[in-house]
């Protein structure tokens, strides 16, 4: 059976939107009005992995681009990157570990924990216009809570 996907945008808990910053980076900033069209639309795929009521394994691709968020070790540090893939083969039910995030729902907010690096989360900075990154702390300065907005296909 083909992998189930939905299109969505994400905003952090400070209502910052995610936009492309160069070919292989996302940044978070406040957008208004027509500028909202700049925000990236994700194709969120529901993939194979350990699942529970509040934790669902997903992969986050950029809609109509052959790019996926992935978590790899760079200089001994878990790092978030945008990785290009062969569009003939993706998305797929059995994604490589680096592409998998545990989507965790808590109090109507979403967290995205790396399946490869437990307790590391997709994060944004308090500051405007800074890169989206993989953070190893929750409840500190950096933001790990998001809301999801559905986008029609």
């Amino acid at each position: 059976a083909p992998v189930r996907s939905l299109n969505c945008t994400l905003r952090d808990s400070q209502q910052k939107s995610l936009v492309m910053s160069g070919p292989y980076e996302l940044k978070a900033l406040h957008l208004q009005g027509q500028d909202m069209e700049q925000q990236v639309v994700f194709s969120m795929s529901f993939v194979q992995g350990e699942e529970s009521n509040d934790k669902i394994p997903v992969a986050l691709g950029l809609k109509e681009k052959n790019l996926y968020l992935s978590c790899v070790l760079k200089d001994d540090k878990p790092t978030l990157q945008l990785e290009s893939v062969d569009p003939k083969n993706y998305p797929k039910k059995k994604m490589e570990k680096r592409f998998v995030f545990n989507k965790i729902e808590i109090n109507n907010k979403l967290e995205f924990e790396s399946a490869q690096f437990p307790n590391w989360y997709i994060s944004t900075s308090q500051a405007e216009n800074m890169p989206v990154f993989l953070g190893g702390t929750k409840g500190g300065q950096d933001i790990t809570d998001f809301t999801m907005q559905f986008v029609s296909s």
Epitope: G49, E50, V72, L73, E83, S84, V85, D86, N89, K94, E96, K97, R98, A115, Q116, F117, P118
Partner: antibody, heavy 120, light 107 residues
Framework: QVTLKESGPGILKPSQTLSLTCSFS??????????VGWIRQPSGKGLEWLAH???????SYNPSLKTRLTISKNTSRNQVFLKITTVDTVDTATYFC????????????WGQGTLVTVSS | DIQMTQTTSSLSASLGDRVTISCRAS??????LSWYQQKPDGTVKLLIY???KLHSGVPSRFSGSGSGTDYFLTISNLEQEDIATYFC?????????FGGGTKLEIK
């Protein structure tokens, strides 16, 4: 010091099930990011990746053999197992287990291999 | 599946030579490539990971390079103990696949 050691039946007949064990020391499969894979090598030929298991129980298989393969682990006993059903003579090979950490995989430590012969 | 091709199955060189072994992927593998040495007794060791990073304990005469689909293992000053078969492995996409191997012999 990390060591891995494969063990198997040595010889078995076509249509039987091959059971392999990888016993290791020097690391724990409960450590986040840790994985163990199985790779085989027919005599005089190249290496073929078969299956892999991560610390969290997540499994991956080579699709060309997937229906015949089952990988499992006993974390407390430091062992990983591979079962191959309905073997044939083409499954005659040296079977290796190897350790990696994180994806993408580099197999950092390898066992010495165990020779399995399938013959009637 | 991603095919990994080592076009040279065997290579003959003299001690002290600089030897380069190549590996070609059927698609871009984002530098997710490692190199392994298999000695005649069957022992396998990791040499290089992530295209160019030297694994701990591996002599500095070994180096790796490449990008996209083309990758190279270079031995800068061939020694007797380097007589072995060398394999590449791609980790970009499941199933992980090895090259067919390059057997290095002494002239």
């Amino acid at each position: 010091q990390v060591t891995l050691k494969e063990s198997g039946p040595g010889i078995l007949k076509p249509s039987q099930t091959l059971s392999l064990t990888c016993s290791f020391s020097g690391f724990s499969l409960s450590t986040s990011g840790m994985g163990v894979g199985w790779i085989r090598q027919p005599s005089g030929k190249g290496l073929e990746w078969l299956a892999h298991i991560w610390w969290d129980g997540d499994e991956s298989y080579n699709p060309s053999l997937k229906t015949r393969l089952t990988i499992s682990k006993n974390t407390s006993r430091n062992q990983v197992f591979l079962k191959i059903t309905t073997v044939d003579t083409v499954d005659t090979a040296t079977y290796f287990c190897a350790r990696n950490r994180y994806d993408p995989p580099w197999f950092v430590d390898w066992g010495q291999g165990t020779l399995v012969t399938v013959s009637s | 599946d991603i095919q990994m091709t080592q076009t040279t199955s065997s290579l003959s060189a003299s001690l002290g030579d600089r030897v380069t072994i190549s590996c070609r992927a059927s698609q871009d593998i984002s530098n997710y490539l490692s190199w392994y040495q298999q000695k005649p007794d069957g022992t396998v060791k990791l040499l290089i990971y992530y295209t160019s990073k030297l694994h701990s304990g591996v002599p500095s005469r070994f180096s790796g390079s490449g990008s996209g689909t083309d990758y190279f293992l270079t031995i800068s000053n061939l020694e007797q103990e380097d007589i072995a078969t060398y394999f590449c492995l791609q980790g970009k996409m499941l199933p992980w696949t090895f090259g067919g191997g390059t057997k290095l012999e002494i002239k």
